[in-house]
Interface confidence: low
């Protein structure tokens, strides 16, 4: 079995005489080792430095010689713990162990921050045997290291399915300073404090942060990095960025607008999509923001009537799509239409007004006193009503329609005619004896058909009665007037 | 939210008159296209339509019992009313009060839960 | 006055069933019909406005059309909460008419 020895284990001898790569008293390399692509780096680390205790695992071979005795346990050598070096150079560390030639197929891995470095890391196992042990070097070399590479490498040998875990190597890359939190551009209300913040690191520390506020600094005295600026208040646009200084130089970060909210700029280009008789489509383009979202619109309609009362309707909507039905329009009437829009600080002024029209409507009232009575003589029905009061609004009269429909027996039948609107008068073939005629018209403009006036019931008797007299609309609160002939 | 909310006697004798109170919250009539409506329903005879009131006094109602109806409307309050005159047990049911928004006859979008009435000697 | 009639008084179906509720205007209506669902002890909630219309977190298995003044309110793979009242209405003129209702029963 192998067991892991305690600090104080006496460290085993590197090799039992010289060989390439052994170190002199003064600890500088008699050879370096060349890497395997022919690569010299910029700083060589030797494998060992006498002295130094050990911390590693240590494994204990229970194998025993010619005379017994049980041989020393393995542990990789002490080497340099922590390399400090400028971004871009190269670095080449490595660690050494020597163990015994009974075994065979040993390999050593390496490791960075707790995880396997596979593949495309520069990495060379060499191996120096003598009669009894084996000295094994693994190197590892980094062409040109990046902040990235910082971290703690390890090497790690498997014998007998025990792991050997050597001490850790630092690597610390310097370089200029390193932002971690740059300020970002705002849109702020006008003279209202608001903060920046800017955050930079090392290595090496510490960093210190200037501000610059339109090419001017802020701070006359650095700050200790994270800095956070609170500027009390701007009447207009600024431009911030922030320098970060270490020793080894200095960084500036990205210059930051911070723009002042203000009020919309009016929309533009309001334009009619659709027109009906009583709504309106319309469309605009937003104006400028004014660096603050839009929250909603205002639809502003006016009648464009010079005899109007001027008043305003209002339709509040939201800032998209840029389209809104105007609803609750009069027909055929002119109106004006303007659209503004507003932001946290407030309302645009009002786009330039267009003017709109809505088409005819249908009419809003049914013909009146609608009379129904039989002319037995020529078998027709004749049937009399008085024009309705059209408004402007409802259009141009066209016609009439009139509805008729038949009911005998149980046989219902209807029937349409349309009729000119210069009468007021209209003459219908009788359709059944023996039945009930009911009538409705209504009026007809280019809007459309309007309300059917109430139903007017007749009967038409068999043929050969005489006494008939005309039906025709009830007065208020009497229903379906039916008048037997 | 959008809630209505009616409120009435709940009994009343024949010739009575009934006085009924829409209250309604999470809009207002002041608000340009608006309005409220009433609508009973009778065990028999399915939902009926009786009268509305716009955001600008417009009303309308049913003709067949127009000449017993009265709709009003408090707009501070957020209040609809609706009396019915002379009432005779025909006038049984639950009595609601809904909304329309957009100005136009249109759908009834929110309803009250309702607040039944027996007229009964 | 326009009448609204809902000939079906009741209807019986079963769950995942495909089932249609007709209503038939007087006279022309346009598209301004509404549907409206009553549940027991409930007010009316609108289903489908103008004519085809999904009210607002109304399940897409409600659909609306119309056939010149024929209206038809058809429920795809019904559910057991379907149960209801379903009720059209105009809004084409004043005074606003109601159909007469078509109850749903779940077999």
């Known amino acids: 079995a192998i067991t892991e020895a305690r600090e104080e284990a006496k460290p085993y001898p590197l090799f039992p005489g010289p060989f390439p790569g052994s170190l002199q008293t003064d600890h500088t390399p008699l050879l370096s080792l060349p890497h395997a692509s022919g690569y010299q780096p910029a700083l060589m680390f030797s494998p060992t430095q006498p002295g130094r205790p050990h911390t590693g695992n240590v494994a204990i071979p229970q194998v025993t010689s010619v005379e017994s005795k049980p041989l020393p346990p393995l542990a990789f050598k002490h080497t340099v713990g922590h390399i400090i070096l400028s971004e871009h150079k190269g670095v080449k560390f490595n660690c050494s162990i020597s163990v015994p030639n009974i075994y065979q197929d040993t390999t050593i891995s390496w490791w960075k921050d707790g995880k396997e470095l596979l593949g495309a890391h520069h990495a060379i196992t060499q191996f120096y045997p003598d009669d009894e042990v084996t000295a094994i070097i693994a190197s590892f070399s980094i062409t040109s290291v990046q902040r990235s590479d910082n971290g703690s490498y390890i090497c790690k040998m498997k014998i007998n399915n025990e792991e050997i875990v050597s001490d850790p190597i630092y690597i610390e890359v310097q370089g200029l300073p390193h932002f971690t939190k740059q300020p970002e551009s705002m849109n702020v209300t006008r003279n209202t404090a608001f903060n920046l913040t800017c955050q930079a690191v090392g290595p090496p520390e510490p960093v210190n942060i200037f501000w610059v506020q339109n090419s001017s600094r802020v701070n006359e005295q650095p700050e200790k990095s994270p800095s956070v600026l609170t500027v009390p208040g701007l009447t207009e646009m600024a431009v911030f960025s922030c320098e970060a200084h270490n020793d080894k130089g200095l960084t500036v970060s990205k210059g930051v607008q911070i723009n002042i909210k203000a009020i919309p700029s009016p929309p533009t280009e309001v334009s009619i999509r659709n027109s009906t008789a009583h709504s309106i489509l319309i469309s605009w383009v937003p104006g400028f923001d004014g660096y603050s979202p839009f929250r909603n619109c205002s639809i502003q309609v006016k009648e464009a009537d010079p005899l109007s009362n001027g008043s305003v309707m209002i339709f509040n909507t939201s800032a998209l799509p840029h389209l809104y039905q105007i609803k609750q329009l009069q027909a055929l009437a002119n109106y004006s239409i303007g659209v503004s829009c507003m932001n946290e600080i407030g309302w645009s002024a009002v786009s330039p007004w267009i003017l709109a029209s809505t088409t005819e409507g249908a009419p809003s009232v049914a013909p009146l006193n609608v009379t129904v009575f039989l002319n037995e003589s020529s078998d027709n029905v004749d049937i009399r009503w008085m024009k309705p009061p059209t408004k402007q609004q409802d259009g141009e009269l066209v016609g009439y329609r009139i509805s008729h429909v038949w009911q005998s027996a149980g046989i219902s039948k209807e029937l349409l005619e349309e009729v000119g609107q210069n009468g007021s008068r209209a003459r219908i073939s009788v359709q059944v004896h023996n039945a009930t005629c009911t009538v409705r018209i209504a009026a007809v403009t280019r809007g459309g058909v309007g309300p059917f006036s109430d139903p007017v019931k007749i009967f038409i008797p068999a043929h050969g009665w005489v006494d008939y007299a005309p039906s025709s609309t009830p007065a208020p609160g009497n229903a379906d007037p039916v008048l037997i002939i | 939210q959008v809630t209505l909310r009616e409120s009435g006697p709940g009994i009343l004798q024949p010739s009575q008159t009934l006085s009924l109170t829409c209250s309604f919250s999470?809009?207002?009539?002041?608000?340009?296209?608006?309005?409220v409506g009433w609508i009973r329903q009778s065990s028999g005879k399915g939902l009926k339509w009786l009268a509305h009131?716009?955001?600008?006094?417009?009303?309308f109602y049913n003709p067949a019992l127009k000449s017993r109806l009265t709709i009003s409307k408090d707009t501070s309050k957020n209040q609809v009313f609706l009396k019915i005159a002379n009432v005779d047990t025909t006038d049984t049911a639950t009595y609601y009060c809904?909304?329309?928004?957009?100005?136009?006859?249109?759908?009834?979008?929110?309803w009250g839960q309702g607040t039944p009435l027996i007229v009964s000697s | 006055d326009i009448v609204m009639t809902q000939s079906q008084k009741i209807m019986s179906t079963s769950v995942g069933d495909r089932i249609s509720v007709t209503c038939k205007a007087s006279?022309?209506?346009?598209?301004?019909v509404v549907w409206y669902q009553q549940k027991p002890g409930q007010s009316p909630k609108a289903l489908i406005y103008?004519?085809?219309y999904r009210y607002s977190g109304v399940p897409d298995r409600f659909t609306g059309s119309r056939s010149g003044t024929d209206f038809t309110l058809t429920i795809s793979n019904v559910q057991s909460e379907d149960l209801a009242n379903y009720f059209c209405?105009?809004?084409?003129?004043?005074?606003?008419?109601f159909g007469s209702g078509t109850k749903l029963e779940i077999k």
């Open positions: 809904a909304r329309i928004e957009g100005g136009l006859p249109y759908y009834y979008d929110y």
């Open positions: 999470g809009f207002s009539l002041n608000t340009f296209g608006m309005g």
């Open positions: 009131i716009w955001w600008d006094d417009d009303k």
């Open positions: 006279q022309i209506v346009g598209t301004n």
């Open positions: 103008s004519t085809s």
């Open positions: 209405q105009q809004y084409n003129s004043y005074p606003f008419t």
